[in-house]
Interface confidence: medium
């Protein structure tokens, strides 16, 4: 059996090497000569030659100092054979212990360390946390057991200690009140790392500690009184610039100014912010009315875009508007009127009075009034009154100029203003209709076959209105009834069938067609007949002598 | 203050005649123009006509035919005269005051209820 | 004459919530001459004669509060009520008074759930 006690050694050890560990030694021995060796990582394996046996004693001895950072543990076996090189013993399993000096100091992950806190923060919030390492034996020795501590703060304002950090964590937290980013916005601290709890090898890092923004100070307007003008009835007219200041950090929410006008009901005046400088632009949202207000005396306050982190009070300005005369257009009331006069309203007579309204209630103005469009040249008006007269006859059925019984003219109200200012009203005529149209065929040219004929459709027209128009009642006259009949087409009596009685000649006819309409407003219309050398339905005729009273007379 | 308040017989028989005054306090119908409205039981407003500071009147088109309003501007009342009333007549009639300043009517009576019924 | 079209002709909300109406005319009524939109908006709330609310399209009438909102130009128009309340059951009317004769749209009843 082998008797083998357990095998430590320090690191770092001073010479003289080989130094001895310990005897290992075999129950065999007694029984005659046993002869020792070792194998292993530091024997016969890389690194080699760290530890020897001697071969006869049994004294294992280690070569060269340690390092447990690089081989905490070795792991040999130790071998025994007689003098005739047979094996005595099993092999055994050696452990040799490297034991710990603080020969590391603790490093930290970084040099720099970067963390930030919100000003204002109270005293216990977290801000970052430092990290060292320690390459000792932190399970069995206090070598690597590392205490973090604080050594300086850059600035010591407003209190020297406004940082603490956790002895075993490092974790850095607030300690004191008074961060303020706008006093100073960044500190550095020196932070320590020693171990054997502190009171051993040390290292430094920096950790800077950025105090971040918030919303502590508000937009202030300087100057707090404006003064502006704007002519009147024009929107979106920038009137003046608000100026504010704001500590808080620039281009972020809490510098960003928000104003906001405190008496505009109507909703007339709109504050926009200029993103690049923050200033306040006063603008019109909706044309002002001089003649309604001529001064606007506005209250406009100023907060940020986030709401105030703490209590603070609303800058506010005074911006005293005011609104410029300026000649406005004449108006006509109502903008568009409708008035309805028969077609055979008499000339020269007065339709309507269509007058305008000077909004420039503080100019004594006077209005001239113009027909500036009258396409069939029938009104006339009075400059001064506005009243508006025809002067040519009016006609409903004169569709070039009434579109569906309307006439439209437009009139112009001219003031004596400085410029002149002009408005436009807008007169629809509803022309009521009378019955001044008789009915009339179309067509009035038609083609018959001299075989066979055809019978023709002749439509009536009358551009009168109902009950001036159908149903109509169509008689043949001057003879014309001898050769030819006309028959209604359709229960309304707005179309007629014309054919001839027997056959006719080729050649040309005339054919008188009295038409009558509703009112018995009648009409004789000559009707151009051609009767052509075909069979069935009319080609192309050829011309022949016209026939009077749908009888051919020979030329 | 602004006041305008009608009176109106309440019922009518069909084919008879209407009349509503409207008597105004406040202001004057000299300066003021006054407007006719009604509204059926249930239903939306219809405008019926104007009368002008001048005296000058227009009228709904499709009621023109059987309606005259005029006033008398020392009395402060406007009158409205509608013939040949029909069931579909029956309604509340308002007068109301344009503004002078955006033609939009900015007061408006209470109302007199008409009932068109034999 | 000019034709008033509104719609819905009527909606349900619940107190807070934003409301909008629509009304349509059948011509402009945009006056070049003064480029104001001649239209009022009314609302009449049950058993009481109509109130003005705005004019000229999107003016509020002194008194009205500034939850009430009017825009549009030419043909198209719309009231906006940004948060409801209560009290603002009714029945809202827009009315043209570009020419004769100043018609009125059919109204939009608006009621809370």
């Known amino acids: 059996d082998w008797v083998i006690p357990p095998i430590s050694c320090p690191e770092n050890e001073k010479g003289p090497f080989p130094k001895n560990l310990v005897q290992i030694k075999s129950n065999k021995d007694k029984e005659g000569k046993v002869f020792y060796s070792i194998t292993g990582q530091g024997a016969d394996t890389p690194p080699v030659g760290v530890f020897i046996i001697e071969r006869e004693t049994g004294w294992l001895k280690v070569t060269e100092p340690l390092d447990r950072e690089r081989i905490a543990t070795y792991t040999l076996f130790s071998h025994a054979v007689s003098s005739n090189g047979n094996a005595v013993e099993d092999p055994m399993e050696i452990l040799i212990t490297v034991t710990d000096q603080n020969d590391n100091k603790p490093e930290f992950t970084q040099e720099v360390f970067k963390g930030s806190v919100m000003e204002g923060a109270l005293p216990g919030t977290s801000v970052m946390e430092v990290t060292a390492t320690d390459a000792d034996d932190d399970v069995n020795t206090y070598n690597a057991a590392i205490a973090y501590t604080i050594l300086s703060q850059d600035p010591e304002l407003p209190d020297k200690n406004m940082f603490t950090i956790n002895r075993n964590t490092g974790v850095i937290s607030v300690v004191t009140t008074g961060l303020d980013r706008e006093s100073f916005p960044t500190y550095t601290l020196v932070v320590q790392a020693a171990d054997l709890q502190g009171e051993g090898l040390s290292t430094t890092a920096t950790a800077v500690i950025t105090v971040t923004d918030t919303n502590d100070n508000p937009p202030i307007f300087n100057p707090t009184t404006y003064k502006g003008q704007v002519p009147e009835n024009e929107a979106n007219v920038v009137i003046t610039t608000l100026k504010v200041t704001d500590a808080d950090a620039p281009n972020t929410p809490a510098w960003e100014a928000v104003y906001t006008i405190l008496n505009d009901d109507g909703g007339q005046f709109v504050v926009t912010t200029n993103p690049v400088n923050n200033d306040g632009i006063l603008k019109t949202a909706k044309g002002l009315d001089f003649e309604a207000k001529q001064q606007y005396i506005l209250h406009v306050a100023v907060t940020n875009v986030v709401p105030f982190e703490v209590s603070l009070t609303t800058s506010t300005a005074t911006v005293t508007v005011d609104v410029l005369d300026v000649n406005e257009a004449p108006i006509f009331v109502p903008p568009e009127k409708r008035v309805e006069v028969s077609e055979d309203f008499g000339v020269g007579q007065e339709i309507t009075s269509y007058t305008a309204q000077e909004p420039d209630t503080f100019m004594e103005q006077k209005i001239t009034y113009r027909i500036w469009r009258d396409t069939a040249n029938w009104l006339e008006i009075n400059p001064d009154t506005g009243a508006i007269s025809t002067r040519a006859e009016l006609d409903r059925e004169d569709f070039e100029h009434v579109k569906n019984s309307t006439y439209t003219a437009l009139i112009i109200a001219t003031d004596n203003g400085s410029p002149v200012a002009t408005g436009t009203g807008t007169l629809l005529l509803i022309l009521s209709d009378v019955n001044d149209n008789a009915p009339i065929p179309e067509p009035r040219t038609i083609f018959f076959c001299e075989r066979n004929p055809k019978p023709q459709v002749i439509n009536i027209i009358d551009a009168d209105l109902p009950p001036n128009t159908s149903p109509f009642t169509a008689e043949l006259t001057h003879g014309a009834s001898a050769n030819w009949t006309i028959q209604y087409n359709d229960p309304t009596q707005e179309s007629i069938i014309l054919k001839p009685k027997m056959a006719l000649e080729v050649g040309d006819y005339k054919i008188n067609l009295k038409l009558m309409d509703n009112q018995n407003k009648d009409q004789v219309t000559t009707l151009e007949v051609s009767v052509c050398d075909c069979e069935g339905a009319a080609g192309v005729c050829r011309k022949a002598q016209p026939v009077e009273a749908g009888l051919q007379i020979p030329a | 203050q602004v006041q305008l308040k009608e009176s109106g017989p309440g019922l009518v028989a069909p084919s008879q005649s209407l009349s509503i005054t409207c008597t105004v306090s406040?202001?004057?119908?000299?300066?003021?123009?006054i407007s006719w409205v009604r509204q059926p039981p249930g239903k939306g407003l219809e405008w019926l006509g104007i009368i002008w500071t001048a005296g000058a009147t227009n009228y709904n088109s499709a009621l023109k035919s059987r309606l005259s309003i005029s006033k008398d501007n020392s009395k402060s009342q406007v009158f409205l005269k509608m013939n040949s009333l029909q069931t579909d007549d029956t309604a509340r009639y308002y007068c109301?005051?344009?503004?002078?300043?955006?033609?939009?009517?900015?007061?408006w009576g209470q109302g007199t209820s008409v009932t068109v019924s034999s | 004459d000019i034709v008033m079209t509104q719609s819905p002709s009527s909606l349900a909300v619940s107190v807070g919530e934003k409301v909008t109406m629509s009304c349509k005319s059948s011509q402009s009524l945009l006056y070049s001459s003064n480029q104001k939109n001649y239209l009022a908006w009314y609302q009449q709330k049950p058993g009481q004669s109509p109130k003005l609310l705005i004019y000229?399209?999107?003016t509020r009438e002194s008194g009205v509060p500034d939850r009430f909102t009017g825009s549009g130009s030419g043909t198209d128009f719309t009231l906006t009520i940004s948060s409801v309340k209560a009290e603002d059951l009714a029945v809202y009317y827009c009315q043209q008074y570009y020419n004769y004769p100043y018609t009125f749209g059919g109204g939009t009843k608006l009621e809370i759930k």
């Open positions: 406040g202001f004057s119908l000299t300066s003021y123009t």
């Open positions: 000229w399209a999107s």
């Open positions: 109301a005051r344009y503004s002078k300043d955006y033609y939009a009517v900015d007061y």
